[in-house]
Amino acid sequence: RKIPKVGHTFFQKPESCPPVPGGSMKLDIGIINENQRVSMSRNIESRSTSPWNYTVTWDPNRYPSEVVQAQCRNLGCINAQGKEDISMNSVPIQQETLVVRRKHQGCSVSFQLEKVLVTVGCTCVTPVIHHVQ
Amino acid sequence: GITIPRNPGCPNSEDKNFPRTVMVNLNIHNRNTNTNPKRSSDYYNRSTSPWNLHRNEDPERYPSVIWEAKCRHLGCINADGNVDYHMNSVPIQQEILVLRREPPHCPNSFRLEKILVSVGCTCVTPIVHHVA
């Protein structure tokens, strides 16, 4: 799917828009809000009843090159006694983000936007029970 | 910027880092993944730290619709279906990259923007601070 060109009069192309070759778009990768920091509660990944670990994936042909992925530590959830309760399930929570992919075709380079699914953390859910007929 | 490995036979004039501005193909790779979390899973209702999903819409951004999670309770749902305040529901937040039209209203000119979204909620043991 292409990025929508919104058709409202609100989106009449202003004179100040830069010229762009057909089939492509101009993308400034100097990130707005680059220095904002996540203010999540302290070490929730360890305090959660569905704890998780983080791993960093690295790809030099991707911008940003570093993407952090979470993995649930358990199949079940941790109960009040600190034991795994397999009557409940730890499940991953995922979120899409955009990255810029750099592609080498011979000596020429092209850039492609890509949607990446990131696992952000885990939550504890009641399982869906499927009964056999 | 990021250092990129180059074909050794290519001219040396190519910049090893990502340039500040790039021309990008309008088609997005992996674009067909489901962007509506209500349709992709029902974890938001089945979780012991359930959440509501609020639609955040901005036509100057791509994607224009982002779903924000808000924890339904301060406590967590226990085995009896009651809200137990011995545990706390907290949002799981994630920085994501989106496209911001720049200059505003331009159809094919964007800048990357980092935004913080609450994706869902998880149940945690609270940190208790007693008064001395």
């Epitope: - | 339904r72 301060l74 809200v83 305040y85 609270p126 940190i127 601070h129």
Partner: antibody, heavy 121, light 112 residues
Amino acid sequence: EVQLVESGGGLVQPGGSLRLSCAASGFSLDSYGVHWVRQAPGKGLEWVSVIWSDGTTTYNSALKSRFTISRDNSKNTLYLQMNSLRAEDTAVYYCARDTHYRLYYYAMDYWGQGTTVTVSS
Amino acid sequence: DIVMTQSPLSLPVTPGEPASISCRSSQSLVHSNGDTYFHWYLQKPGQSPQLLIYKVSNRFSGVPDRFSGSGSGTDFTLKISRVEAEDVGVYYCSQTTHAPFTFGQGTKLEIK
């Protein structure tokens, strides 16, 4: 206009039971949490229980074994079933709406006028 | 249970003068999500309580701007910049961070 009207109070003997009602109008009970709060004569406020928009509940553990909160969405009415009543349960009982829906403040923004429960032999 | 302690319990004030009520909780009211669920209510004579301030410092709709709330953690304050005759009643602090939700014992504001 948001309105909460309590009823069902009265004189009851120790050990007896009573069911209080709170009729809500101007909003839907399946969109907001609603609390019961009581006030003994000449005393301060004491929180009793809440039923949240999704039907889950939270109780004051000191009262949970004797009091049960429930609601009927079709009547948009909240209930408090009180059993094994004691003299110390004598109070004005208020229902109060929680701000929770979409706002997530967890405060009580609209209160009923209260219904008086007297437990005496 | 969280104990909420208000002071003073009685507050005689001259109209037009400022007033201040303190409330201290026995435990921090900061939730794991970083927010503080501390509120102020006013119960006017013969009436039901009404919400004045929610989440420490936010005035509820229709509440005059002479009322302000502040504080953090365990110590909170309600200030009235210029008391008016209609402000008389009992002021209660409250917390909904921890269950059971609790109220302070109340501060009775009266006009001198």
